[in-house]
């Protein structure tokens, strides 16, 4: 099933092309399905999903998170601010998705699909935000050193990092999906 298509949603071949908001909605749901599959492997492989030591590892990560000031929540919603936050957040997640690439055995293709689908999603959203102020892109040098640092962690921390990235990315996408439905 191609990125952005969900087998249970595939409609008749004569249907008109998807509009931008439809593509975005389907793309996010496709990525969320991928994350679910990756989380399943992670949770089967270790006990990280039940661990109470998450906070320790979370302190070392700077994973994008929705905050009130980002304007993506029901109270204080702001379409422009929120759209910028979603795109910026996804761009920041890219280095963490790169880290995930060598972290899966049976779901290696799924990890690649999540990464590539996220790149496509960013392109969709950038088109939607073409009239907004410039969106800051993470510094490649900083990303490279972060990746090196993450890959140098011990096994326990790498497992925990994988778990936290997937959980945070899922929460970020779910918040984005709800917000985008008011756009």
């Amino acid at each position: 099933v191609p990125p952005g298509e969900d087998s249970k949603d595939v409609a008749a071949p004569h249907r008109q092309p998807l509009t931008s908001s439809e593509r975005i909605d389907k793309q996010i749901r496709y990525i969320l399905d991928g994350i679910s599959a990756l989380r399943k492997e992670t949770c089967n492989k270790s006990n990280m999903c039940e661990s109470s030591k998450e906070a320790l590892a979370e302190n070392n990560l700077n994973l994008p998170k929705m905050a009130e000031k980002d304007g993506c929540f029901q109270s204080g919603f702001n379409e422009e601010t929120c759209l910028v936050k979603i795109i910026t957040g996804l761009l920041e997640f890219e280095v963490y998705l790169e880290y995930l690439q060598n972290r899966f055995e049976s779901s290696e293709e799924q990890a690649r699909a999540v990464q590539m689908s996220t790149k496509v999603l960013i392109q969709f959203l950038q088109k939607k935000a073409k009239n907004l102020d410039a969106i800051t892109t993470p510094d490649p040098t900083t990303n490279a050193s972060l990746l090196t640092k993450l890959q140098a962690q011990n096994q326990w921390l790498q497992d925990m990092t994988t778990h936290l990235i997937l959980r945070s990315f899922k929460e970020f996408l779910q918040s984005s999906l709800r917000a985008l439905r008011q756009m």
């Epitope: 949603d9 409609a11 008749a12 249907r15 008109q16 998807l18 509009t19 908001s21 439809e22 909605d25 029901q74 109270s75 204080g76 919603f77 702001n78 379409e79 422009e80 759209l83 009239n131 999906l177 709800r178 917000a179 439905r181 008011q182 756009m183």
Partner: antibody, heavy 120, light 111 residues
């Protein structure tokens, strides 16, 4: 308490124009996408137009495309529908509706409607 | 504009169960979980009953339930009461960023 109060309806000749307004209160107006839905006398409901929460995106039914314009003023908590080149088939009660938060295409609050009659 | 297909009328006795169907295509009802149902009492604005196919709106009794199979959605009203007498409309997202409504079904509670 959520309230949506429409105004601006009336009798207009074919080819004429009208501007409908919807005053919203009891919720954070700028957080919600909004729509106009109409109901011809004794007929069913017909979706007319939608506008995103910040007014960036607008959508129209084919039957009104190019003639109607939806807009909003979040500072005034007001939704508008500018109707030009009106036709007799545009005669209906026009409802201002709110989209449910985080749900696609479900309308959780409706105004009481304003009557638009297009007749010579 | 495109319209979803509903039966013009249904009826049932108090305490009984009635089901209203809403037939569409793979471009609307069958496209995703974007079906909602509305109740319109005489002379009033419509009211949301069900959204996302089967989720009840706030304050709606569990006598109302929704389901979907393929390109057809259904609204089931159990334990019919006289105050349920109204017009019922289904609505669905339609590809192309439109919404489609059904033609409406008039429910009559007998007796």
């Amino acid at each position: 308490e959520v309230q949506l109060v429409e105004s601006g309806g009336g009798l207009v000749q074919p080819g004429g124009s009208l501007r409908l307004s919807c005053a919203a209160s009891g919720f954070t107006f700028s957080s919600y996408a909004m729509s106009w839905v109409r109901q011809a006398p004794g007929k069913g409901l017909e979706w007319v137009s939608r506008i995103s929460s910040g007014g960036i995106s607008t959508y129209y039914a084919d039957s009104v495309k190019g003639r109607f314009t939806i807009s909003r003023d979040n500072a005034k908590n007001t939704l508008y529908l500018q109707m030009n080149s009106l036709k007799p088939e545009d005669t209906a009660v026009y409802y201002c509706v709110r989209y449910a938060w985080g749900v696609q295409w479900a309308f959780d609050f409706w105004g009481q409607g304003t009557q638009v009659t297009v007749s010579s | 504009n495109f319209m979803l297909t509903q039966p013009p009328s249904v009826s049932g006795s108090p305490g009984k169960t009635v089901t209203i169907s809403c037939a569409g295509t793979s471009s609307d009802v069958g496209y995703g979980n974007y079906v909602s149902w509305y109740q319109q009492l005489p002379g009033t604005a419509p009211k949301l009953l069900i959204y996302n196919v089967n989720k009840r709106a706030s304050g709606i009794t569990d006598r109302f339930s929704g389901s979907k199979s393929g390109n057809t959605a259904s609204l089931t009203i159990s334990g019919l009461q006289s105050e349920d007498e109204a017009d019922y409309y289904c609505a669905s997202y339609r590809t192309g960023d439109n919404a489609a409504f059904g033609g409406g079904t008039k429910l009559t509670v007998l007796g």
